[in-house]
Amino acid sequence: REPTVQCGSETGPSPEWMLQHDLIPGDLRDLRVEPVTTSVATGDYSILMNVSWVLRADASIRLLKATKICVTGKSNFQSYSCVRCNYTEAFQTQTRPSGGKWTFSYIGFPVELNTVYFIGAHNIPNANMNEDGPSMSVNFTSPGCLDHIMKYKKKCVKAGSLWDPNITACKKNEETVEVNFTTTPLGNRYMALIQHSTIIGFSQVFEPHQKKQTRASVVIPVTGDSEGATVQLTPYFPTCGSDCIRHKGTVVLCPQTGVPFPLDNNKSKPGGWLP
């Protein structure tokens, strides 16, 4: 029978670490991490890490009992967890009978939005106490709410990941810019900022009709040339406060009728809050 892995949590040091080993298996040949989605009961989905590793093809894998994987996450707070994946059989060959290296994977470490993870793995038995053993590590940064997978998470939807304000902005005259955008039921307060290397104008927008989408319009006084300037729209939603996903547009000249010109180059960018 071919070896498979059975993985379970192991928070402390592995018991083998306390024993003296004359010989130890070699290090891993490769370690990779990618996010995968799994649906959860609430109708939302969670993002998990798919950690896969490749064993070195030599006789030292005959000593291999397990591979231990530890993940440290750094964002607003630090997290640390480890799993030990035991091999169900001893290795009878250095490569898979069908060809290629022995490759295994574990899906289970939860992924938070916009977090840097350090994933380390080593084979067991590992080096003796006070000795450096062969290990491998990779970094993985989870995406924020603008990511094509993450944006459908409930937390991101509440932060406005699916909201398209469809910003249009035009220069009415030398002193004013008219900004139009589609509001969202997620919140009723917005900040419109006009930048041309420096901030040349801004305005708070309060939209009382929070329950439905409407088209809001605001005329903003400016202190410099506004043509080609960037409009940044910052919403204030209950879930993300002042660090919600920001949206951008560009100021063009208003048509003679005074009707704002629709823009194709609307871009979104996250603020300080990358959920």
């Epitope: 093809a57 030599d58 060809g99």
Partner: antibody
């Protein structure tokens, strides 16, 4: 049955290169590493040059030969190759290809190619 | 690199005798050892792998033993076809190395 076929001999000039072939049959080529071994003379010992995994072309060399030998495979024809470069009289030897077993014992050997640098 | 020291370098024996060839590794190779036989002008042939396992078609008069760093190949009741050179090889981790060889000749 498993067969590894090598040409009998190659005569090359000093400073030139030679590409030795090892045509295989009778087994799944991508399932086993292929090794190359040098034997300097009739009574001389065996030296492991390196090995290649035909599945993904991963190569491991004996440091002594890393600037002398280049290992490749052609999966479509189930053949392994070793190119020897910048040849000198020291490289005159018999070169064997040898297929690994479950681990790297050499279960099957080619007949060997005698390389003469002259 | 692991050094493999084989002894004796040569041996002159008669048909029907028993011989033992030894191989010492410079470090523990965890029983990852093979033995090969080579006849003049021919390629080496696998005799024994994993210290004790006989390769297909190898007569039972051949036997291997050992562990750690010390290994041996025993040939009981030598036959005329057993004469030639014998090599040990470790396959613990690359780079793999062979012993210097033992030349077995008829007395």
């Amino acid at each position: 049955q498993v067969q590894l076929q090598q040409p009998g001999a190659e005569l090359v000039r000093p400073g030139a290169s030679v590409k030795l072939s090892c045509k295989t049959s009778g087994y799944t080529f991508i399932s086993y590493w292929m090794n190359w071994v040098k034997q300097g003379g009739p009574e001389q010992g065996l030296e492991w040059i390196g090995r290649i995994d035909p599945y993904d072309s991963e190569i491991q060399y004996n440091q002594k030969f890393k600037d002398k030998a280049i290992l490749t495979v052609d999966k479509s024809s189930s053949a392994a190759y070793m190119q020897l470069i910048s040849l000198t009289s020291e490289d005159s030897a018999v070169y064997y290809c040898a297929r690994s077993g479950g681990f790297d014992w050499f279960a099957y050997w080619g007949q060997g190619t005698l390389v003469t640098v002259s | 690199d692991i050094q493999m020291t084989q002894s004796p370098a040569s041996l002159s024996v008669s048909v029907g005798e028993t011989v033992t060839i030894t191989c010492r590794a410079s470090e523990n190779i965890n029983s990852n050892l093979a033995w090969y036989q080579q006849k003049k002008g021919k390629s080496p042939q696998l005799l024994v792998y994993d210290v004790t396992n006989l390769a297909d078609g190898v007569p039972s008069r051949f036997s291997g033993s050992g562990s750690g760093t010390q290994y041996s190949l025993k040939i009981n009741s030598l036959q005329s076809e057993d004469f030639g050179s014998y090599y040990c090889q470790h396959f613990w981790r690359p780079p793999y190395t062979f012993g210097g060889g033992t030349n077995l000749e008829i007395k």
